[in-house]
């Protein structure tokens, strides 16, 4: 799998998306999940709704998002709030018993806010953009990794 | 605060249909997937529709497949339900509500539906 | 589907006490359980999610705590205003909700 970057801006909403083939992947739960150490484990942050049919339900857990477009075949996955933190190596995975496939390998990058000091329409508000059928995202900008690129820092 | 006025409910013979309306106010309404949820005489809940942010995809617990087509118009900031060959057990009072994060954070005043002879 | 079963279809209590409202999944569900109260003539409104959050605007004598299959919503000190109906709902598959809980006052 290649890396797409996403890069998003702190303090603001970063929009990931993960295309997949909706008949090869139907029935199949989906998980947005932490790539812990180039050869580590990915943990799991976020899974759509147990129940497949409602995958359509956005699903939080602290202020990460996941929805899933399950005719049109994108998963898709809000970082509310970005943080320099939140900058990393990730995987969006559908499921299928206790296995797990990977969707799209995702490197986000987080960049400096232009403005040091943020008046309230900068602010996210909760709920705002709560489907995928008409989410607006602004400053999403995603590349795809040049083969040879190393999204973690070598170790020494 | 969230807003959300139904209409529509009244009294209707077994076998007829009905169309109910919940109007929604102050939020941004596309954002949000929403639902229908009934009150029986016995204060019983029961899940009738869900629906998409933007209407694509809609989900009916088994018990309720087949009568009821739960629908939206986002450009008028309306949800619907329509109900068909009506029975005496669907005598309720019909909320639509919100959905956030899976549960359902605002509800609406309701409308009565009553199916007599 | 899931059946949520809330034992006590009414509980009496005393402005002042404490009382506890207890509700039983069918099967696990994962702390996808909220509690609705319902005021006489009212619709229900939301006060706790995810078994232990409570929603905006609700007061802090409102608890929420359990996990697995066992829940309860807890009143540390109950209020006149807090006659109601109460119900668990669990969104962790299809929906399905409590039978509810009376709180009477004494």
């Known amino acids: 799998h290649n890396t797409t970057v996403f890069q998003g801006v702190a303090g603001q909403s970063l929009q990931v998306s993960c295309p997949y083939d909706s008949m090869k992947h139907w029935g199949r739960r989906k998980a947005w999940c932490r790539q812990l150490g180039e050869k580590g484990p990915c943990q799991r942050v976020v899974s759509t709704h147990n129940l497949w049919l409602l995958s359509f339900l956005r699903r939080w857990n602290g202020s990460t998002a996941i929805t899933d477009d399950t005719l049109g075949g994108t998963l898709t996955i809000t970082l509310r709030n970005l943080q320099p933190h939140d900058a990393g190596l990730y995987q969006c995975q559908s499921l299928h018993g206790s296995e797990a496939d990977t969707l799209r390998k995702v490197l986000v990058e987080v960049l400096a806010d232009p403005l040091d000091h943020r008046d309230a329409g900068d602010l996210w508000f909760p709920g705002e953009s709560e489907s995928f059928e008409d989410a607006h995202v602004e400053h999403s900008i995603s590349r795809s990794l040049l083969e040879g690129e190393i999204p973690f820092p070598p170790t020494s | 605060e969230v807003q959300l006025v139904e209409s529509g409910g009244g009294l209707v013979k077994p076998g007829g249909s009905l169309k109910l309306s919940c109007e929604a106010s102050?939020?941004?309404?596309?954002?949000?997937?929403m639902s229908w949820v009934r009150q029986t005489p016995e204060k019983r809940l029961e899940w009738v529709a869900a629906?998409?942010?933007?209407?694509?995809?809609?989900y009916y617990p088994d018990s309720m497949k087949g009568r009821f087509t739960i629908s939206r118009d986002n450009a008028k900031n309306f949800l619907y339900l329509q109900m068909s060959s009506l029975r005496s057990e669907d005598t309720a009072m019909y909320y639509c509500?919100?959905?956030?994060?899976?549960?359902?954070?605002?509800w609406g005043q309701g409308t009565t539906l009553t199916v007599s002879s | 589907d899931i059946v949520m079963t809330q034992s006590h279809k009414f509980m009496s209590t005393s402005v002042g006490d404490r009382v506890s409202i207890t509700c039983k999944a069918s099967q696990g569900v994962s702390t996808a359980v909220a509690w609705y109260q319902q005021k006489p003539g009212q619709s229900p409104k939301l006060l706790i999610y995810?078994?232990?959050t409570r929603h905006t605007g609700v007061p802090d004598r409102f608890t929420g705590s359990g996990s697995g299959t066992d829940y309860t919503l807890t009143i540390s000190s109950v209020q006149a205003e807090d006659l109601a109906l109460y119900y668990c709902h669990q969104h962790y598959s299809t929906y399905t909700f409590g039978g509810g809980t009376k709180l009477e006052i004494k």
């Open positions: 629906i998409s942010g933007g209407g694509r995809y809609t």
């Open positions: 102050r939020f941004t309404f596309s954002s949000y997937a």
């Open positions: 509500a919100r959905h956030y994060d899976g549960y359902l954070d605002y």
């Open positions: 995810w078994a232990s």
